[in-house]
Interface confidence: medium
Amino acid sequence: QFPRVCMTLDGVLNKECCPPLGPEATNICGFLEGRGQCAEVQTDTRPWSGPYILRNQDDREQWPRKFFNRTCKCTGNFAGYNCGGCKFGWTGPDCNRKKPAILRRNIHSLTAQEREQFLGALDLAKKSIHPDYVITTQHWLGLLGPNGTQPQIANCSVYDFFVWLHYYSVRDTLLGPGRPYKAIDFSHQGPAFVTWHRYHLLWLERELQRLTGNESFALPYWNFATGKNECDVCTDELLGAARQDDPTLISRNSRFSTWEIVCDSLDDYNRRVTLCNGTYEGLLRRNKVGRNNEKLPTLKNVQDCLSLQKFDSPPFFQNSTFSFRNALEGFDKADGTLDSQVMNLHNLAHSFLNGTNALPHSAANDPVFVVLHSFTDAIFDEWLKRNNPSTDAWPQELAPIGHNRMYNMVPFFPPVTNEELFLTAEQLGYNYAVDLSEEEAPVWSTTLS
C-alpha cells in the first residue's frame, strides 16, 4: 500500500514519502520538471457517524497520516507517488494529451484473442511481484518491528496487492491480541462504496496495461443481471468451471485452478496481532453457486435502481432508503425500500457466487470480483450520466468513517478523495459498451449507452 522506496526506517520515522523522480536525488516529486512538490497531507476533519465511535484507535483514521503526513502533491495532470505518472485519462511525457477513452465491454463479446489477453493478464498479475509497492504486515505502532528499527513490510504480486487493498479496507480495528472491534468498513456500507471500487478497478486496469504493454487494455464486465440460477462466466473458457470431483474447487482446465488465496484468515491475524502478509492460504473456492435455488438479479432490478434520483440518503449507511448507492450495493431492494432480509444487485451477486467471493475480506481473490465490479461500476456510471449530480449530492459529513466526500480512500496511496472519483467514466478515460435502458442487446451488437 506504500511505495517500497518510502518504507525505510528514515521514511517511516519522518513520516515523509516524497521520493525523487529519476536518478537526480534533488528532483523530489519531479519538482525540477514542474511536476509536483512535497506537501502536507490534507485529510478530512469533519465528523463521521456511527457505528465506529472510537477515536485515534485505528490506523486508518485521518488516512494516511498515521503513516505519512507529507507526500508528493502533483500539479496539473501529473500523478503518482513521485509525480512520475499521469492522471487517469491522460498520457504523454507532459500528461497533456487526452488519452483515447478505453472501452470496457461485456466479457461474452470478447474475441478469443481478447479473452486470452484478459485471462493471461490476470494470470501474469498473479505471478508478478509489484515493482513499486509493498504491503505492511503490522499495525501502525508496530510498523518498525520489535526493535523499532525494521519496517514490517512484504513484497507481493500485483494481483495479491489488489486483494490486500480490499482486505485492508474492511478489516477489523484491532484493540489488542484476539480482540477485534467490528464496526468499520471503508469500502462498503456507505457512499464510498462506488468510488472506492471504481478506483480499485482503475488501479488494477492500469497495472494490467503496464504488465501487457498495452495502453488501451480494458477490463471487461460481467452483466450479472440475468435473473438466472447459473454463473455464465464460470466456464473454462472464461473464469473457470467447477471441478467434477470437488465442485468447490475450480476445474483443472482453467488457469485459475492453481490460484491460491491471500488475506482470508481474519481471526488468525486478530489472534496473532498482525496483518495479512500475503502468505498463500489455500486454493480459490466457489462453493455451489446459486445454492438454495438463489437467482441472480434481473435487468428490471438494474432499471429500478437507476430510477432512484438521490445518490445517497441519511444515515448514509446500510439502512439508507431510496438511495441509489444503497440499492446498487444491495442492502436496499432495487426500488430503494429497505428489507433487511433481502440482498440485491451487487450483494446478491457476491452471495450467489458463495465461497471465497462471499466474504468481503477475501472476495477480491476470485477474478470474478473484477468483472462483477466492472458491471457495478457501469451501473454507477449510467446513473452519473443520467443525473449529472453536483458534488453536493455527496455528504460532506456524518457519513460513516471513510465515506465523507473529502475523506482519503483507504488504503490508496498517494491519497485520493472520494470527490475525485465522483466523475463520469469518460472524465476518467474510459467508457462502457452497455445499454442499460432495455434488455441488453445480444453480445454481437452491444451498443454504447
Epitope: W140, G142, L175, G178, V273
Partner: antibody
C-alpha cells in the same frame, strides 16, 4: 506466545501510593491497548482504564480519575499503574489485560 | 456510560444440563461484546469475542449469540470444569464496563 507478567503482592498503609507493573511478551507491545481491571474479594470486575503504550494515549473510567495513573516503558515492554491516596476500598486484585490475554493479577492490601 | 445487566446472578445446575446466561446493554453495542469465565483464585479467561466468535481452545459446547442490546452465552452439556463465574464486557466506547457476573454452582 502472548504473556502478561504482573508484579507481586503489595501490603500498603492508608494514604500511601503503589505502582504496579505488567510486562508484556510475545507481541508488539507498542501497538495495542493495555487495560487495567479491579476485582475486590467476592466482587465482580471493574474496568479502570487503558493505555496505548506506543503513543501514551490513555482512557480512564471517570470513577478512577485521580486514583489511577497509567504509564508505559516501551524499552522494557512494561506498563505501569500507580494508585494514589490508598484507602481500604482500594484493597483488591488488579489485573492487566491486552485483548484476549490477562496477567495473573496483583493483590494489593491496604491496612493500617 | 453503558450499563451491562447480567442475569441470573447465580445458578445451581447439574452436570450434563444446558444453561444460558444473558447480558443486556443499556444501548446498542453492535456485537462488541466478550464473555469470560473465571475460576476461584484465577484470572478471567476469554471464551467468546465479538458476541459470537469462540476464542482459541474453547470447547464447542460454549456458544455466544445476540445483537443490538441483547446477548447470551449458552453452555451445552455442562462439564464439572465449567463451574465458576461468568462475566460479559462490552467494547463499545469507554468505559468498557462488565456485567455483574453469574456464579455457576454444582447442584
Amino acid at each position: 506466545q502472548v504473556q502478561l507478567q504482573q508484579s507481586g503482592a503489595e501490603l500498603m498503609k492508608p494514604g500511601a501510593s503503589v505502582k504496579l507493573s505488567c510486562k508484556a511478551t510475545g507481541y508488539t507491545f507498542t501497538g495495542y491497548w493495555i487495560e487495567w481491571v479491579k476485582q475486590r474479594p467476592g466482587h465482580g470486575l471493574e474496568w479502570i482504564g487503558e493505555i496505548l503504550p506506543g503513543s501514551g494515549s490513555t482512557n480512564y473510567n471517570e470513577k478512577f480519575k485521580g486514583k489511577a495513573t497509567f504509564t508505559a516503558d516501551t524499552s522494557s515492554n512494561t506498563a505501569y499503574m500507580q494508585l494514589s491516596s490508598l484507602t481500604t476500598e482500594d484493597s483488591a486484585i488488579y489485573y492487566c489485560a491486552s485483548g484476549a490475554y490477562w496477567g495473573q493479577g496483583t493483590l494489593v492490601t491496604v491496612s493500617a | 456510560d453503558i450499563q451491562m445487566t447480567q442475569s441470573p446472578a447465580s445458578l445451581s445446575v447439574s452436570v450434563g444440563e444446558t444453561v444460558t446466561i444473558t447480558c443486556r446493554a443499556s444501548e446498542n453495542i453492535y456485537s462488541n461484546l466478550a464473555w469470560y469465565q473465571q475460576k476461584q483464585g484465577k484470572s478471567p479467561q476469554l471464551l467468546v469475542y465479538a458476541a459470537t466468535n469462540l476464542a482459541d481452545g474453547v470447547p464447542s459446547r460454549f456458544s455466544g449469540s445476540g445483537s443490538g442490546t441483547q446477548y447470551s452465552l449458552k453452555i451445552n452439556s455442562l462439564q464439572s470444569e465449567d463451574f465458576g463465574s461468568y462475566y460479559c464486557q462490552h467494547f463499545w466506547g469507554t468505559p468498557y464496563t462488565f456485567g455483574g457476573g453469574t456464579k455457576l454452582e454444582i447442584k
